[in-house]
């Protein structure tokens, strides 16, 4: 029950996170005009990854797309790439995790397959979240650098009475949406990975190998501790000796050519 809850919660948190990453990527307010020097501006500038906009006090808003690809700063291109990679990975992760949900039955899918899918989607969510956080952080760093550069150059070129006052930009709402969304996706991914531990079968698929000693039969189990996934936690006390030469989870063990020496 706890596993299903963890998996379900991880899925929902990741879903919200990815929706937030998509929203942040599409938002125009990645950077907004700094109003510290002029809080009563008539023209408010703000910029996104895809276009820059102006909101006038007249109520009119106009946006202008970045129609060039080669003319854009490499950092902006990198941020775009990181956000898109984050969205793609997140979308694939969501698709995989839907089929991995314990509450959804698809044919005769085994728990091990669901565990693997849960782990895969979890890793995808983690990488997706990291991509979003990295993208937003790179953009934020770019803003901070440009902010101080434009502050230093604010009144340069004051030839005669003409002043060129540079428009300074500060953090926009999209940055905070991106950071939160990336964090949620990351948390959702971690929850999926945790849920994977509980979904994985308690035992490995190794059959018990029986050694017949002269007085009594001894079953040596090489899979006493899980070594396959690394997520297996052996909290239960396992039987090492079992007269019936049967694995603990099996109702019946069929002999094979490896069973007896």
């Amino acid at each position: 029950m706890a596993v299903t809850a963890c998996q379900g919660l991880g899925f929902v948190v990741s879903l919200i996170g990815i929706a937030g990453i998509i929203a942040a990527t599409c938002m125009d307010q990645w950077s907004t005009q700094d109003l510290y020097n002029n809080p009563v501006t008539a023209v408010f500038n703000y910029q996104g990854l895809w276009r820059s906009c102006v909101r006038e006090s007249s109520g009119f808003t106009e946006c202008r797309g970045y129609f060039t690809l080669l003319g854009l700063p490499a950092m902006l291109q990198a941020v775009r790439a990181l956000m898109i990679v984050g969205i793609v990975l997140g979308a694939i992760g969501l698709l995989v995790s839907i089929f991995a949900l314990k509450c959804i039955r698809i044919g005769s899918m085994e728990d091990s397959a669901k565990a693997n899918m849960t782990l895969t989607s979890g890793i995808m969510f983690i990488v997706s979240g990291l991509c979003a956080i990295a993208g937003v952080s790179v953009f934020a760093n770019m803003l901070v650098t440009n902010f101080w550069m434009s502050t230093a150059n604010m009144y340069t070129g004051m030839g005669g009475m003409v002043q060129t006052v540079q428009t300074r930009y500060t953090f926009g709402a999209a940055l905070f949406v991106g950071w939160v969304a990336g964090g949620l996706t990351l948390i959702g991914g971690v929850m999926m990975c945790i849920a994977c531990r509980g979904l994985a079968p308690e035992e490995t698929n190794y059959k018990a190998v029986s050694y017949h000693a002269s007085g009594h039969s001894v079953a040596y189990k090489p899979g006493g501790f899980k070594a396959s996934t690394g997520f297996g936690s052996n909290t239960k006390n396992k039987k090492i000796y079992d007269g019936g030469a049967r694995t603990e989870d099996e109702v019946q063990s069929y002999p094979s050519k490896h069973d007896y020496v």
Epitope: A42, E56, S58, E62
Partner: antibody
Framework: EVQLLESGGGLVQPGGSLRLSCAAS????????MSWVRQAPGKGLEWVAT????????YYADSVKGRFTISRDNSKNTLYLQMNSLRAEDTAVYYC???????????WGQGTLVTVSS | DIVMTQSPDSLAVSLGERVTMNCKSS????????????LSWYQQKPGQPPKLLFY???TRESGVPDRFSGSGSGTDFTLTISSVQAEDVAVYYC?????????FGQGTKLEIK
């Protein structure tokens, strides 16, 4: 047809008060930012005040700040300018204007004359 | 505050002549957001309220004859009348629309010789 009709002007003594009104018609008044601009006799144009669409923000020229108040009543399609502590230099024709894209003033009223004199 | 300076203060030209008037701002009126210059031009005929000619420095208002043209960017702007007509006699004002307080130039008076 867009129309802006100012009223409320007249002769007032220095230190007195006056309230100008601008009745708007022919357009959705509540969807536009509105301004007052004045012109002293034989002089150039001077922007006085602006009130944005919702009325939540108002902007004033330094020369009238603290004395004049711009307001609007969207239900009555009317723009107001409350003028207190009037001075001789406030004597002018006051125009009511509508702001459009580019912050340009595309429609102007015929103006109302305010004379501040003792 | 942004200071708007127009030149010349007045000019007298013959009918059909080409006329150019200038407007200089103390700060750039170019918006980085949409790459538009926030400057308007107005025409005021005697005894009438001003009439909008151009916004965004060069976008002609509907109904304005195409003999009028607006140009310029940043801090230097120009209003040109390619062939002056008798009805063009007026005072022409430029206005800063970029930041409050909105400021007008002192005006350029156009007369016919």
């Amino acid at each position: 047809e867009v129309q802006l009709l100012e009223s409320g002007g007249g002769l007032v003594q220095p230190g007195g008060s006056l309230r100008l009104s601008c009745a708007a018609s022919g357009f959705t008044f509540s969807s536009y930012t509105m301004s007052w601009v004045r012109q002293a006799p034989g002089k150039g144009l001077e922007w006085v005040a602006t009130i944005i669409i919702g009325g939540s923000y108002t902007y004033y020229a330094d020369s009238v700040k603290g004395r004049f108040t711009i307001s609007r009543d969207n239900s009555k399609n009317t723009l107001y300018l409350q003028m207190n502590s009037l001075r001789a230099e406030d004597t002018a024709v006051y125009y009511c204007t509508r702001l459009v894209k580019g912050q340009a003033m595309d429609y102007w009223g015929q103006g109302t004359l305010v004379t501040v004199s003792s | 505050d942004i200071v708007m300076t127009q030149s010349p203060d007045s000019l007298a030209v013959s009918l059909g002549e080409r006329v150019t008037m200038n407007c200089k701002s103390s700060q750039s009126l170019l918006s980085s957001g949409n790459q538009k210059n926030y400057l308007s031009w107005y025409q005021q005929k005697p005894g009438q309220p001003p009439k909008l000619l151009f916004y965004w420095a060069s976008t002609r208002e509907s109904g304005v004859p195409d003999r009028f043209s607006g140009s310029g960017s940043g801090t230097d702007f120009t209003l040109t009348i390619s062939s002056v007509q008798a009805e063009d006699v007026a005072v022409y004002y430029c206005q800063n629309d970029y930041s409050y307080p909105f400021t007008f130039g002192q005006g350029t008076k156009l007369e016919i010789k």
